[in-house]
């Protein structure tokens, strides 16, 4: 996240992180319910972790945290690498969560966000657009959800309704390593992080996000069936 | 399957502005998962990366080179170009041009698709 | 800028030998931004392995990549004889840097 700020401790307590090894974050992702995490199709790996209830960027141990493997990632079925449609996945995880004030899903948006919607999207990607910086504790960042025509002009013959653009004002934006974490709307999850300009950060050139409320149905479905 | 081919004059006089094209085809380069770069080889020596741009016209420089290098994009060409400042001899070199892929996670996945290379000599 | 040094600068190998090719950086870098190239005289680079570890498609499993910190390295299992080329490094941490290379001939 660049420009953002030091999160509240546990108020974003659906954020998780995509582990590489022991400790190598590599995306963001968002628990929906006890067993389910959402995160970005191209987040993909054959094996990692998932860290939860994790304040900090260093794998020193905090109370709140849990960890798990996933023993299952489901990639939406329209998501092709390299491209953007449908970047979504869902990971259920080796066991159910613990409820606590630090690990707690977020409810999925039904309806999706209409412009000037005021956001919140997280994560502990790089804070410097063209270099990386890392945060030491998990980054906040408000943004606004932009209309149609303003997220096309910024990336013409890129944007379909399965992404949403928010964000642009210059030097505020999500990042590399924010992939897969939550933009929360009122409260409710609307969407993933899914990309952007490289740089980052750069004028007329908003973050992208997966817009979840084209998704509900399947991923209640394939929750569901799995 | 995609090919960078690079082209522009083999002789450049001290002082003046190197200028090459890198021509996509094969594929387009107007898309959002990849960044477009040049990368030089002085004769007989290592890789040196100079910059890259986004179909969109975003540019990353080389610090070093920074003052004196300007990479642009024509999408309706699907081309990219350099542009080297003030040359010396020290500018003498094969140029390549090459594609990364780029997204959000915190993954580098390489330069996986390169031009065969252009050599420039700067010299009056 | 991150400085890469490769090392042995020339490695004397038989076909069949195992290759093991250093790669040091001045300071820390992420092995998600660490990757290596082959290149044979006359060619363009050619990417062999990304993320210090995964290969790049068409990359036989002879080839692996491993390491974290400072010090990486690429490991030929059995060198075959198109094999003997020069390899570099990449780091792309912060501004991207590239390693002296180290050249892989046959003994």
């Known amino acids: 996240i660049v420009n953002g700020s030091d999160c509240q401790k546990d108020a974003q307590p659906w954020q998780g992180a995509l582990l590489l090894g022991p400790n190598k974050l590599y995306c963001g992702a968002v628990l929906i319910s006890p067993q389910w995490l959402l995160t970005a199709a191209h987040c993909r790996k054959p094996v990692f972790r998932i860290r939860l209830g994790h304040h900090s960027m260093s794998p020193v141990y905090e109370s709140g945290q849990q960890m798990f493997q996933g023993i299952k990632s489901i990639p939406h079925p329209g998501y092709s690498h390299p491209g953007h449609s449908n970047d979504l996945m869902l990971i259920k995880m080796n066991r159910k969560i613990r409820d606590s004030h630090s690990v707690k899903p977020v409810e999925i948006a039904c309806d999706c966000a209409t412009e000037g919607t005021r956001c919140m999207v997280s994560g502990w990607g790089t804070t410097s657009s063209s270099h990386n910086n890392f945060p030491k504790v998990l980054q906040c960042l408000n943004i606004t959800v932009l209309s149609e025509e303003r997220c096309k002009n910024s990336y013409p013959g890129q944007i379909d309704k399965t992404m949403f653009c928010a964000g642009d004002e210059e030097g505020r934006d999500s990042c590399q390593g924010d992939s897969g974490g939550p933009v929360v709307c009122n409260g409710k999850l609307q969407g993933l992080v899914s990309w952007g300009d490289f740089p980052c950060a750069q004028r007329n050139r908003p973050g992208v996000y997966t817009n979840l409320c084209e998704f509900v149905k399947w991923i209640k479905d394939t929750m569901n069936s799995n | 399957q995609l090919q960078l081919q690079e082209s522009g004059p083999g002789l450049v006089k001290p002082s003046e502005t190197l200028s090459l094209t890198c021509t996509v085809s094969?594929?387009?380069?107007?898309?959002?998962?990849?960044?477009w770069g040049w990368i030089r080889q002085p004769p007989g020596k290592g890789l040196e990366w100079i910059g890259s741009?986004?179909?969109?016209?975003?540019?990353y420089y080389n610090p070093s080179l920074k003052s004196r290098v300007t990479i642009s994009v024509d999408t309706s060409k699907n081309q990219f170009s350099l542009k080297l400042s003030s040359v010396t001899a020290a500018d003498t070199a094969v140029y390549y041009c090459?594609?990364?892929?780029?997204?959000?996670?915190?993954?580098?996945?390489?330069?996986?698709?390169w031009g065969q290379g252009t050599t420039v000599t700067v010299s009056s | 800028e991150i400085v890469l040094t490769q090392s042995p600068g020339t490695l004397s190998l038989s076909p069949g030998e195992r290759a093991t090719l250093s790669c040091r950086a001045s300071?820390?870098?992420?092995?998600?931004?660490l990757a290596w190239y082959q290149q044979k005289p006359g060619q363009a680079p050619r990417l062999l392995i990304y993320?210090?570890?995964s290969r790049a498609t068409g990359i036989p499993d002879r080839f692996s990549g491993s390491g974290s910190g400072t010090d990486f390295t690429l490991t030929i299992s059995r060198l075959e004889p198109e094999d003997f080329a020069v390899y570099y490094c990449?780091?792309?941490?912060?501004?991207?840097?590239f390693g002296g290379g180290t050249k892989v001939e046959i003994k």
């Open positions: 090459a594609r990364g892929e780029y997204d959000r996670s915190y993954y580098y996945y390489g330069m996986d698709v």
């Open positions: 094969g594929g387009s380069i107007s898309s959002s998962s990849y960044y």
């Open positions: 741009i986004s179909y969109s016209g975003s540019t």
């Open positions: 300071q820390s870098v992420s092995s998600s931004y």
């Open positions: 993320g210090a570890s």
């Open positions: 990449q780091q792309a941490f912060s501004s991207p840097t």
